[in-house]
């Protein structure tokens, strides 16, 4: 299909261009020299004008953006869907863990409820927030749980004669809890397990969300003017010569795409590393690195820790009686 | 030993989490995700090839367009940029990634570093310090049944199988997602630009 002779009309070009841009005022009636063209430089007369070239460039860049979006659609769907599923699944685990812990208190230590329910609720609220990326210290969460529980255990189970707990004696009891290692090494055990499992869970979710961000970024890339010109030349300049049905050469397309996507392709190395690192993380997510495992078993460890306090009750009551005597006197007054 | 509520426990020791026939644990779901993600490991290197294969390119025609003229599909001119004098393709590549891409690369570098830091070395699932403190019980069965807590009376074997499929309002099957399945080449050191994005199954 040779280029049209100078006397030929631009009828075919006109009808093709009409699809892109309603309004034919930019298409010459007959081929013109095209000396003002900047992209589709003609070897002879051309059916393109400068305005048409600009429209072609815009369309080429839009085409490219759409192609990129369709390329990433399945991957984007995969990560978005899984990020949502895992986030909800983790919240369900936390909810179950809270219910198990509350059930354990209700069935084994009814005198500690409803206060224990509130402390447990606070703890698991913080667990949820930590997983979602909040600036909360896991050790503080665990310490807070045991600091809160001990005054209630002491006033309800070990020394029931004390009046309704007041913040003053509670603060002394909270301090005693740490100083006397009232719960033995259970708080430390829980800290280790919870912090390890939650850290891994948190980074897993963080990584999935970053994956979405990576795909979104490349999905909405704006291509440079240079790229737009290359794409125009590849996809549309043939039209100017009346070659409507001709397609770009495969090798030429690859060269143009690599030029347009040179920046994007630089992500490749880090993307590969991202998937392999995520795989490594996932392979290690078991036992104390698996929040499902750790949180759903917390009720048992907390139960054991309270038994430990009960076992040492007599000794503790004497020591704490002396340690918090000042606060207790103030409370009785 | 603690009294465990009937609705939560079978046999007072094994945790019963959900009454669903389809067993799907969080860990199996994670592994499944990784397998699917690995099929996209070549996503970025394969993008140029994918886009060419999904845009009009001469496949069966004898003649094709090289940016300047009609040429034979297998001629030397076919792969050459027909107007290379107008502006340099090499120059375009040398400009480097645009700021948003550089930003995302930095974020990927950061998360990769975090992921590597957090990854558990094989065979080192529990900290040495924990082992030394004697807080880890001896043998607690396979990966599905892990012990938590100190040994002794209160030890509970937690059956690690929350079956979330039943509870989640999502259809977890990604296989019939919109868009074409994309596949590519699996070897890490060999990037082929075929008509695809991703990895060969």
């Amino acid at each position: 299909q040779p280029p049209p002779p100078p006397d030929a009309t631009c009828h075919q070009v006109r009808s093709f261009f009409q699809r892109l841009q309603p309004g034919l005022k930019w298409v010459p009636e007959t081929p013109v020299p095209g000396s003002d063209l900047q992209v589709c430089l003609p070897k002879g007369p051309t059916c393109c004008s400068r305005k048409m070239e600009e429209k072609y460039q815009l369309t080429a860049r839009l085409n490219m953006e759409q192609l990129l979006q369709s390329a990433s659609m399945e991957l984007k769907f995969l990560i978005i869907q899984n990020a949502a599923v895992f986030q909800e699944a983790f919240e369900i685990v936390v909810r179950h863990a809270k219910n198990y812990t509350n059930a354990m208190f209700k069935n084994n230590y009814p005198s500690l409820t409803p206060q224990a329910f509130e402390f447990v609720g606070e703890f698991f609220t913080d667990v949820s927030l930590y997983i979602l990326g909040s600036d909360i210290n896991v050790d503080d969460m665990v310490n807070e749980l045991f600091d809160s529980l001990f005054p209630v255990i002491y006033t309800q189970m070990m020394n029931p004669g004390l009046p309704e707990s007041v913040l003053d004696i509670n603060e002394c009891l909270r301090g005693a809890r740490r100083d006397l290692k009232v719960f033995g090494s259970f708080p430390k055990l829980i800290m280790t397990q919870v912090s390890k499992s939650l850290q891994v869970t948190r980074i897993f979710l963080q990584a999935l969300n970053l994956g979405i961000e990576v795909i979104n970024t490349t999905d909405h890339l704006k291509f440079s003017k240079d790229c737009g010109r290359m794409l125009t030349r590849m996809w549309y300049c043939s039209y100017c010569q009346g070659l409507m049905m001709v397609k770009p050469c495969g090798g030429y397309c690859n060269v143009v795409m690599q030029g347009c996507m040179a920046g994007v392709v630089e992500i490749d190395k880090y993307w590969r590393e991202y998937i392999l690192s995520l795989e490594e993380l996932v392979n290690g997510m078991y036992r104390i690195y698996d929040m499902e495992n750790v949180l759903l078993g917390l009720f048992s460890t907390i139960h054991d820790s309270i038994q430990y306090v009960q076992k040492n009750g007599g000794k503790l009551t004497t020591t704490i009686g002396k340690l918090c005597a000042h606060s207790q006197q103030r409370q009785y007054r | 030993s603690a009294y465990y509520p009937e609705d939560l426990f079978i046999d007072k020791k094994i945790l019963k989490v959900a009454h669903v026939e389809h067993e799907e644990t969080l860990s199996s779901r994670r592994r499944e995700l990784i397998q699917k993600l690995k099929s996209f490991i070549n996503f970025y290197s394969a993008l140029p090839g994918y886009i060419c294969s999904h845009s009009p390119v001469a496949e069966n025609d004898t003649l094709c367009w090289n940016g300047q003229e009609l040429v034979e599909r297998y001629s030397q001119k076919a792969a050459r940029n027909g107007m290379k004098n107008q502006f340099n393709l090499h120059e375009l590549k040398m400009k480097g990634p645009e700021p948003v891409v550089s930003q995302i690369i930095d974020k990927l570098k950061h998360i990769n570093q975090l992921l590597r830091t957090m990854s558990v070395p094989k065979g080192k699932v529990l900290d040495k310090s924990l082992d030394e403190e004697g807080l880890e019980s001896g043998d607690c069965g396979d990966d599905e049944d892990e012990c938590i807590g100190s040994s002794g009376d209160g030890m509970v074997k937690v059956k690690n199988q929350l079956r979330f499929l039943a509870e989640l309002a999502y259809d977890l099957d990604v296989d019939d997602a919109p868009g074409n399945k994309q596949h590519g080449n699996q070897k890490d050191n060999e990037i082929t630009t075929s008509h695809s994005v991703g990895n060969m199954p």
Epitope: D126, S128, L132, D135, L167, N170, R174 | -
Partner: antibody, heavy 116, light 102 residues
Framework: QVTLKESGPTLVKPTQTLTLTCTFS??????????VGWIRQPPGKALEWLAL???????RYSPSLKSRLTITKDTSKNQVVLTMTNMDPVDTATYYC?????????????WGQGTL | QSVLTQPPSASVAPGKTARITCGGN??????VHWYQQKPGQSPVLVIY???KRPSGIPERFSGSNSGNTATLTISGAQPMDEADYYC?????????FGGGTK
């Protein structure tokens, strides 16, 4: 931006129940980490915390007023309601509702204008 | 009587540094927040989590917290800083305010 507005009766007879509504915009009570709290301030006195409701419907109450207070939320209407039973002249105060960031140790970062 | 103790009043010459304390048993282990309240207005958060300043709060406001005392510092106090200041902390499941410092 975040705004909160308290509404309710200006006068309540002793022994009656006070119902206060906090209508807010700029955030949702279904977002993880968000809470809404109620605080009161008798004329010329200090601030006193009454109740706090979390995004996950957990509720916290002042121990000294717990038996008289109920806090509820209507996520779709962007409202939180506080009811206080058995009102007494000593309960005369300006009642504020505030947005709480639960993760930041329950800080109250945005306050309503208050209702007397 | 509040578990968080604040001096009822404090005064400072303009341009000088004002320090308001908030005392409480082992308060250093808690996160303390500070609010400023001008007459007839709602309280405004000026410092949260001991030391953090919300956007829009001047740099002259700073906080610290250790042992049994949390402190709000106003460096180069200005007449517009005249107000009541309240400290607040979260005790397990209870929100506690100090008695306020004028």
């Amino acid at each position: 931006q975040v705004t909160l507005k308290e509404s309710g009766p200006t006068l309540v007879k002793p022994t009656q129940t006070l119902t206060l509504t906090c209508t807010f915009s700029g955030f949702s009570l279904s977002t993880s980490g968000v809470g809404v709290g109620w605080i009161r301030q008798p004329p010329g006195k200090a601030l006193e915390w009454l109740a706090l409701i979390y995004w996950n419907d957990d509720k916290r109450y002042s121990p000294s007023l717990k038996s008289r207070l109920t806090i509820t939320k209507d996520t779709s209407k962007n409202q939180v309601v506080l009811t206080m039973t058995n009102m007494d002249p000593v309960d005369t105060a300006t009642y504020y509702c505030a947005h709480s960031r639960i993760a930041a140790r329950r800080v109250l970062d945005y306050w309503g204008q208050g209702t007397l | 009587q509040s578990v968080l103790t604040q001096p009822p009043s404090a005064s400072v010459a303009p341009g000088k540094t004002a320090r308001i304390t908030c005392g409480g048993n082992n308060i250093g282990s808690k996160s303390v927040h500070w609010y400023q309240q001008k007459p007839g207005q709602s309280p405004v958060l000026v410092i949260y989590q001991d030391t953090k300043r919300p956007s829009g709060i001047p740099e002259r406001f700073s906080g610290s917290n250790s042992g049994n005392t949390a402190t709000l510092t106003i460096s180069g106090a200005q007449p517009m800083d005249e107000a009541d200041y309240y400290c607040q902390a979260w005790y397990s499941t209870i929100m506690v305010f100090g008695g306020g410092t004028k």
